[in-house]
Amino acid sequence: SIPWNLERITPPRYRADEYQPPDGGSLVEVYLLDTSIQSDHREIEGRVMVTDFENVPEEDGTRFHRQASKCDSHGTHLAGVVSGRDAGVAKGASMRSLRVLNCQGKGTVSGTLIGLEFIRKSQLVQPVGPLVVLLPLAGGYSRVLNAACQRLARAGVVLVTAAGNFRDDACLYSPASAPEVITVGATNAQDQPVTLGTLGTNFGRCVDLFAPGEDIIGASSDCSTCFVSQSGTSQAAAHVAGIAAMMLSAEPELTLAELRQRLIHFSAKDVINEAWFPEDQRVLTPNLVAALPPSTHGAGWQLFCRTVWSAHSGPTRMATAVARCAPDEELLSCSSFSRSGKRRGERMEAQGGKLVCRAHNAFGGEGVYAIARCCLLPQANCSVHTAPPAEASMGTRVHCHQQGHVLTGCSSHWEVEDLGTHKPPVLRPRGQPNQCVGHREASIHASCCHAPGLECKVKEHGIPAPQEQVTVACEEGWTLTGCSALPGTSHVLGAYAVDNTCVVRSRDVSTTGSTSEGAVTAVAICCRSRHLAQASQELQ
Amino acid sequence: QEDEDGDYEELVLALRSEEDGLAEAPEHGTTATFHRCAKDPWRLPGTYVVVLKEETHLSQSERTARRLQAQAARRGYLTKILHVFHGLLPGFLVKMSGDLLELALKLPHVDYIEEDSSVFAQ
């Protein structure tokens, strides 16, 4: 008798005999920027403080009739999903509501900005525990709204937003496109993307994860004990705001980067049917459905990594694409991908005191993506070692020569347009795991890191015949930090990490001759941190 | 998720003006930009967020807003400062004619200006 959405986000160990996780989120304050709410609804009475903040445009239409229950509908439901007594995710969380949407559910970028500023000022006047800000709204791409979200996030606030209900690329909307915001798409009881009339959930690289967002039972503003089902990416975002409140209550010192990595780590993987998404968006859209961690204890011993895709470079000959990690994350590897296969590889380079991943388009290419592997690695000291194109026929090599540094990723970049078209493959000599190898005409970049207790190993999976996709996964307890293709094949479209699996994609096999060039090898670098494990054991 | 990704329109307008010799005029060569929502029905022309450079103080924001009002008045335009931002971003929200955008982009400390637009419950 527990609603499907609460069951879905609850780990199996909690499900017996209707048992739900303990009332969580009590140390956290969740700000809701939405419509007005019915604060005396039984679900949220005493949990939601209605602030005096209101900045909404006039309702459209001369004959618009303001009906309180309709004005309150959206916000009341979301407040209930976050913290409702019976149908809420974080039943212990307290909330504050700001009215930025009118009775028709419409607001302005400027009103939202002033609301975010109000939260920042409140935080400065009366610092409390962790803050979560839920933005269940979307407008067109807005530089200023994204900038405000970035500033608030850098002030230590966790922002969660709806991906949008436009069945479109979330990067075209704000605040969904802001990198610092946790952007949430919607799935249904069958773990499929939510369809809303002719539209549906947004998707793409700006979405961080999905969460239940169809037929979500929650507080109805029709009466003080009423419930109603609503659907949308707002409902999905409210689930993640609730999960974030639970996590932050258990571990109040979590940074935004740590929280995001944990949300990704504890999500259900590969359950969404990607066929719903446009073909060009499938690889970019995370196949993750949010869930609560299996216990409220921290998972600090784990090495957490996530994959960050860049925007598309565009088709011009010298076009590049850049993928960046969050300020608290380390870039441990860099790869690239092009649907046409025409690319000139990728390299890690310093930009503003931080490493970024840059991918290069090739002449005649339709454009490339840069793919960064972004990890939480405390006390890390990482650097990039580069070997220019080699003169010798045996190929280019580079390794981590500094004491205590381990290889976390390999990248290669070349100036010639079609590297490998008529060149034999180069094979890595066995027993040299700490080195990257590549074509003699390519420059090779090794990501070398020193961190307490960090150990890494190379894992390969080669297929002699042409395959559209070759994968290699890291085993339990190890985290994928690097993903690349062994050089030598002209038809490799690129490599990227999906959760703990390295994926190497090749051109349609029907167009490739079954020669030795058809051989594809996926190379994964798998790491773990003994230091983090020890620190966790000492805490417990 | 970078700024340059968005499917929005950017209009770059020249900064130098013979008509207004401004004190604190921006350094030569810097360009303030104008942004507006790519989805036309969601645009709200007539209200603009003027974003100032990162280290601008509240007093400078207020001074810049007043300067815009004064220069607009000299051209016969009414403007209304709806809000002065500080705490997150330095800047101000102004209700004015779009005819004044070129003038506003030339003000000292201006980083960019964005036309207001609608957001919707999802």
């Epitope: 008798s1 005396d40 019976d86 149908a87 039972i217 009466c223 004990t225 009423c226 419930f227 | -």
Partner: antibody, heavy 126, light 106 residues
Framework: QLQLQESGPGLVKPSETLSLTCTVS??????????WTWIRQPPGKGLEWIGS???????YYNPSLKSRVTISVDTSKNQFSLKLSSVTAADTAVYYC??????????????????WGQGTLVTVSS | EIVLTQSPATLSLSPGERATLSCRAS??????LAWYQQKPGQAPRLLIY???NRATGIPARFSGSGSGTDFTLTISSLEPEDFAVYYC????????FGGGTKVEIK
């Protein structure tokens, strides 16, 4: 079939605390589908809702009585209790306990008070 | 709070007659109104919920109608066991009850 039974002292002195317990039989108080409610009826007068509690111990009180009311639940004993502090003669009434469907699971039944206990008269007098 | 006013306070009718009881709310309660029957020395019993739905085991002679602020409970043909006090109750905003209508034998 679910039954509710109120118990507690029938006489309480003014300024003291009234304490009543409702024992639920024929069903579990630990179900997430229900709220457990106290309602009172002064002699010859109408009904007044006092407050409700769910199996997690989350409470919801009548605003006019909130400062004096405490409702608690003991799922191990299948009981819930009412405490009303600083009583006066105006608190003399028949006190009923009742079940209310929370509304989260529509299949659990209508979102109203049903069934009720038979009621217990509490007189406030010195 | 929402005040419910019941009328008449007392209704004197004979068995077999039709009874019409009224409940008026001080503001709209939509359809979130119920009717209860209470016999002397007994607890109230739910008859009608959400303005017009009969509760389990309630005879078809009981019917409810109305929405917003005006509601009616109709007993099409009074049986001897129907003589009792009837209360309306709303849940639009918290929970409040009407003052009751006593249906007595004429």
């Amino acid at each position: 079939q679910l039954q509710l039974q109120e118990s507690g002292p029938g006489l309480v002195k003014p300024s003291e605390t009234l304490s009543l317990t409702c024992t639920v039989s024929g069903g579990s108080i630990g179900s997430s589908s229900y709220y457990w409610t106290w309602i009172r009826q002064p002699p010859g007068k109408g009904l007044e809702w006092i407050g409700s509690i769910n199996y997690r111990g989350s409470t919801y009180y009548n605003p006019s009585l909130k400062s004096r009311v405490t409702i608690s639940v003991d799922t191990s004993k299948n009981q819930f209790s009412l405490k009303l502090s600083s009583v006066t003669a105006a608190d003399t009434a028949v006190y009923y306990c009742a079940r209310e469907n929370s509304g989260v699971v529509p299949a659990a039944g209508p979102n109203w008070f049903d069934p009720w206990g038979q009621g217990t008269l509490v007189t406030v007098s010195s | 709070e929402i005040v419910l006013t019941q009328s008449p306070a007392t209704l004197s009718l004979s068995p077999g007659e039709r009874a019409t009881l009224s409940c008026r709310a001080s503001q709209s309660v939509s359809s979130y109104l119920a009717w209860y029957q209470q016999k002397p020395g007994q607890a109230p019993r739910l008859l009608i919920y959400d303005a017009s739905n009969r509760a389990t085991g309630i005879p078809a002679r009981f019917s409810g109608s109305g929405s917003g602020t005006d509601f009616t409970l109709t007993i099409s043909s009074l049986e001897p066991e129907d003589f009792a006090v009837y209360y309306c109750q709303q849940r639009r905003n918290w929970f409040t009850f009407g003052g009751g209508t006593k249906v007595e034998i004429k």
